[in-house]
Interface confidence: low
């Protein structure tokens, strides 16, 4: 039979510049001598020779003189390879090939890693900052491997994913320098943290910057939004209302208005330096420019999609600033259910039938209720599934298994919990023939 060669399944992780041991072992039979052993280490993909032992002696390294065996341990079945001064270019799979009378081989992966430096943070602009200003924060970390994962968060630990641009460049040794840029609208003050993670070492390098903009002595701007979520039908336009009270002598040149996604801080729309800067949100947003001077900072969101659902922050800065968040709840009505019956002919009392109620393209997920002709709820033997399509709209299929009586009507009600809209379907079974109600 084949010789059993064992290597670790998990990659061997080695830091750049250190030595790594690629473990490989076999079980020598009684009476085994090294003269019988043929041991070859090679690169799995290219079959390039790395190191070999043959004819009773170590044939040496064929890999930049940076490999060695453990000669004193070979007789006990230890065929491990020592790789010195590990480089990024060493990363990959190595095959340990052992031949005595029979042969066997196994591949072990080398994962190279290098820790990232503590990030340095820079701010642009870095003086005369006021609430409502847009600043660019750059986080830089050096000489790591493999490519880093970069995370930004605010002082409360909330992730900031909008308006982040991250670039990673490898140097001649293959080590990466990472630069991540966050564009953010300043609040009253704020801490912004950058975390650079080495995904292999699970090593996190942190830095943060706290920005305290200059404030004027006047009170904060009172920004008002509706407390209840704004409900909008998919495909229609929605208005996210936001208002502030302009002081006497107020002019639009003084106004900084920013709409952004509350969670990610992604910019949606802005008005600065006396003019509308336009939509940063798929060109589906607009302000009400004629009403801005009266304090109406509302946002029009066109052709609403399921993906728009969530919280939007209206941020107003004049001399001082204020902000408030409004929730958008997206909805779509469910279609009138279609009813199918299986089996659908030669039905007799006592037969078990499967009634399927299907309703399409609603949002959010529906509540489904079944009842008999007397309005009594039917809860046993009901299976309901809801599947979202690419637009995020749900198709609902509810299946009722029931034992037929002499005759009966079975009704299905599909309710949209946001719109409180009910869509009904029913089927009446009267032995033979069976009748369906006409479509409404």
């Amino acid at each position: 039979g084949a010789l059993e060669v064992q290597v670790p399944e998990d990659p061997v992780v080695a830091l750049v510049g250190t030595d790594a041991t690629l473990c490989c072992s076999f079980s020598p039979e009684p009476g085994f001598s090294l003269a019988q052993l043929n041991l070859i280490w090679q690169l799995t993909d290219t079959k390039q020779l790395v190191h070999s032992f043959a004819e009773g002696q170590d044939q040496g390294s064929a890999y930049a003189n940076r490999t060695a065996l453990f000669p004193d341990l070979l007789a006990q079945g230890n065929a491990s390879l020592r790789l010195q001064r590990v480089r990024v270019a060493d990363e990959g799979s190595f095959t340990c090939f052992v031949s005595i009378r029979d042969f066997g081989s196994a591949a072990v992966s080398l994962q190279v890693a290098a820790p990232y430096s503590k990030p340095s943070m820079t701010l642009e602009p870095n003086k005369d900052l006021r609430p409502g200003d847009t600043v660019t924060i750059t986080c830089s970390s050096y000489q790591g491997y493999p490519e880093a994962e970069v995370f930004w968060q605010d002082g409360q630990g909330v992730p900031l994913t909008g308006n982040v641009t991250t670039s990673q460049m490898a140097n001649e040794q293959g080590l990466f320098d990472v630069h991540s840029i966050l564009r953010v609208v300043l609040g009253a003050n704020g801490t912004y943290s950058c975390l650079v993670r080495n995904p292999v070492l699970q090593q996190d390098a942190h830095s943060s910057v706290t920005i305290t903009p200059q404030r004027s002595p006047t009170g904060a701007v009172e920004v008002q939004v509706p407390e209840d979520p704004v409900v909008a039908l998919v495909g229609t336009d929605a208005t996210l209302r936001c208002s502030f009270s302009p002081e006497p002598g107020f002019s639009l040149a003084q106004l900084n208005l920013i709409w952004q996604l509350t969670d990610t801080k992604q910019l949606v729309h802005s008005f600065t330096e006396g003019r509308d800067q336009g939509s940063a949100y798929a060109n589906r947003t607009a302000l009400f420019p004629d009403l801005l001077a009266q304090g109406n900072a509302s946002l029009r969101l066109q052709r609403v999609r399921v993906a728009d659902e969530g919280s939007f922050t209206c941020f107003v800065s004049i001399r001082d600033f204020g902000s408030a968040a409004v929730s958008l709840q997206v909805a779509a009505p469910y279609s009138k259910p279609s009813m199918t019956l299986e089996p659908n002919k030669d039905l007799r009392p006592g037969d078990t039938v499967t009634i399927t109620c299907s309703s399409y393209r609603g949002y959010p997920e529906a509540e489904v209720f079944w009842q008999d002709g007397q309005g009594v709820p039917l809860t046993g033997n009901v299976t309901t599934s809801q599947m979202a399509n690419e637009q995020g709209l749900f198709d609902v299929h509810s299946v009722l298994r029931v034992v037929l009586g002499a005759n009966g009507t079975y009704s299905c009600l599909v309710r949209n919990p946001v719109l409180q809209q009910d869509a009904h379907g029913s089927v009446t079974i009267t032995g033979q023939p069976m009748t369906f109600p006409p479509e409404a």
Epitope: P8, E9, D10, V13, C23, S25, V200, L201, Q202
Partner: antibody
């Protein structure tokens, strides 16, 4: 011969804690990733957590994140699962398995029952 | 609901060939190798197929695995009564950063 022996299961009240152990033998424990997999009564398999050979990298299912902690002591050839804030839905047989990506050996499991 | 989809049941008569499917997505089966496990009644699961189609020593060659795109299949030929068990597919999901199993398929030998 590879052997994995789980222990530490039992009856615990909701909100309580348990620590499961898995004693490994028959292979070089420190060279292999390890995992915990559970199976609720009459249900399918659910991966719970995995850990790299050295113990530095750990992964968790969303359902246990923040409540369960996987660890290992390579000097004792033992894998652990610390389970806090236990819920009724954590009731299951917990298996320890060798490797992280293909579970080539499994223990016989230890039953954890969370009930008041 | 499982990330990987398997039929809940399958059946066949002795000597027949049965196939069990496992459907996933690009983040799991599409980018990682699939493993199959067999769980006989009242016992711990056992590795049956790894790396899509490889059999560990001791597993009969009646069991075979294959993969195409985001789906995998386990085929059992020459069905025997001792094959009656639950079969699970599994793989790593890169999006979830987690190992995922199929819901399991109960194989009945009629």
């Amino acid at each position: 011969e590879v052997q994995l022996l789980e222990s530490g299961g039992g009856l615990v009240q909701p909100g309580g804690s348990l620590r499961l152990s898995c004693a490994a033998s028959g292979f070089t424990f420190s060279s292999y990733g390890m995992s915990w997999v559970r199976q609720a009564p009459g249900k399918g398999l659910e991966w719970v957590s995995g850990i790299y050979s050295g113990g530095s990298s750990k992964y968790y299912a969303d359902s246990v994140k923040g409540r369960f902690t996987i660890s290992r002591d390579n000097s004792k050839n033992t894998l652990y699962l610390q389970m806090n804030s236990l819920r009724a839905e954590d009731t299951a047989v917990y298996y320890c398995a060798k490797n992280r990506l293909r579970f080539d050996y499994w223990g016989q499991g230890t039953l954890v029952t969370v009930s008041s | 609901q499982s990330v990987l989809t398997q039929p809940p049941s399958a059946s066949g008569t002795p000597g027949q060939r049965v196939t069990i499917s496992c459907t996933g997505s690009s983040s799991n089966i599409g980018s990682n190798s699939v493993t199959w496990y067999q769980q006989l009644p009242g016992t711990a699961p056992k590795l049956l197929i790894y790396s899509d189609s490889h059999r560990p020593s001791g597993v009969p060659d009646r069991f075979s695995g294959s993969k195409s795109g985001t789906s995998a299949s386990l085929a059992i030929s020459g069905l025997r009564s001792e094959d009656e068990a639950d079969y699970y597919c599994g793989t790593w999901d890169a999006s979830l950063n987690a190992y995922v199993f199929g819901g399991g398929t109960k194989l009945t030998v009629l």
